[in-house]
């Protein structure tokens, strides 16, 4: 799976938040950022994730698509120069320091499962998605694809406004 | 190559409702959004809503949410759209449209039926 | 309901001309805009997409741009098969919406 610019195609500012209405919040304790999932009190402001969108060459063709066999693949940056990361070791997401160009456990294809909600699968560990556990994200394995409507990797996005790059 | 081969013209009278067809060929049909748009007699174009034949979810613009049923069938790679209490203001061209992206809806166009007319009349 | 206008409704131009049409947003939607090309009799099809980013196949003569509310489509090199209506859309957010069209006629 390639991707196919070096630039994002979209970018949008938003907020992420979980199947069933809670938020993902980023805190930084000891240097590093922790990735929560939590009920926000009423007028708690959500955090703010920029989602940028690449289009990525789907690695096989035997669909018969040809060129046209795109996908959508997402990385996810609540604060500058940190992106989620898919550790597939350890089946966790977390937040990493990282430099462009951003290393493939950066990358998530973006699967709309329902109308309104996302799902994200690792691209270096296909059929593994961002999911929820114990309150916090984690790598989550789909096994087929009648899973991928599980609630716990399906996500809401609220977005605030367009993110205009350069 | 992709294709998205529509069913044909119908002549239909007020208060009927109609199904019309779009069989998917060329692509992994569960793998992408299908949408549908209408395009009345020298008019501009309405999208009417999409769905996901892989899971059946779809999403609608409410204008047309009690107007149209989206459904698929997944064995035939067709997709269908049926239309209740037909009036002569559901008149129009419709296309079956899908996407140029595996797994997500931008709602963007990239490949279109042949359009299906529809004239509701007595 | 974010609305699409499209300006002007129609222009005369000749092969060879360089052409500029025009779609504004009623409100702010970024660079989620695509313009299709609708030929006499046929289905429309896709031609930019993002704002400026040229679909697979689709001729370098056309090229997209703006950002926000305000954005153009512009034809170098104006060939026959352009004769067409051209329509933008905002795409990404539900429900996409098309402007009303711009017809391009050839002299």
């Known amino acids: 799976m390639s991707i196919t610019g070096i630039s994002p195609i979209t970018e949008y500012l938003a907020s992420l938040s979980t199947y069933n209405d809670q938020s993902i919040t980023f805190a930084l304790e000891d240097e590093s950022y922790e990735i929560y999932v939590e009920d926000l009190k009423k007028d708690e402001k959500k955090d703010k994730v920029l989602l940028s969108y690449y289009e990525s060459q789907h690695p096989s063709n035997e669909s018969g698509d040809g060129v046209d066999g795109k996908m959508l693949m997402v990385t996810l940056s609540p604060t500058k120069d940190f992106w989620l990361h898919a550790n597939n070791k350890e089946h966790s997401v977390e937040l990493h320091k990282s430099e462009k160009p951003l290393p493939d456990q950066a990358f998530f294809v973006l699967h709309n499962m329902h109308s309104n909600s996302v799902s994200f699968e690792s691209k270096t560990d296909p059929g593994v998605f961002i999911g929820v556990k114990d309150n916090h994200l984690a790598l989550i394995k789909v096994d087929s694809s009648e899973n991928l409507s599980t609630e716990n990797i399906l996500f809401k996005l609220s977005e605030t406004h367009h993110h205009h790059h350069h | 190559q992709v294709n998205l081969l529509q069913s044909g013209a119908t002549l239909v009278k007020p208060g009927a409702s109609m199904k019309m067809s779009c069989k998917a060929s060329g692509y992994s049909f569960t793998d992408y959004w299908v949408s549908w748009v209408k395009q009345s007699h020298g008019k501009s174009l309405e999208w009417i809503g999409e769905i996901y034949p892989n899971s059946g979810a779809n999403n609608f613009n409410k204008e047309f949410k009690d107007k149209a049923t989206l459904t698929v069938d997944k064995s035939t790679s067709t997709a269908y759209m049926e239309l209740t209490r037909l009036t002569s203001e559901d008149s129009a061209v419709y296309y079956c449209t899908r996407g140029p992206y595996y797994y997500s809806s931008q709602i963007i166009f990239a490949y279109w039926g042949q359009g299906t007319l529809v004239t509701v009349s007595s | 309901i974010i609305v699409m206008t499209q300006s002007p409704k129609s222009m005369s131009i000749s092969v060879g001309d360089r052409v500029t049409m025009n779609c504004k947003a009623s409100?702010?939607?970024?660079?989620?805009i695509a313009w299709y090309r609708q030929k006499p009799g046929q289905s429309p099809e896709l031609l930019i997409y993002?704002?400026?980013n040229r679909y697979t196949g689709v001729p370098d003569r056309f090229t997209g741009g703006g950002y926000g509310t305000d954005f153009t489509l512009t034809i170098n090199s104006v060939q026959a098969e352009d004769a067409a209506f051209y329509y933008c859309?905002?795409?990404?957010?539900?429900?996409?919406?098309f402007g009303g069209g711009t017809k391009v006629e050839l002299k």
């Open positions: 409100q702010n939607v970024g660079n989620n």
């Open positions: 993002y704002a400026s």
């Open positions: 859309q905002r795409i990404y957010n539900s429900p996409p919406t």
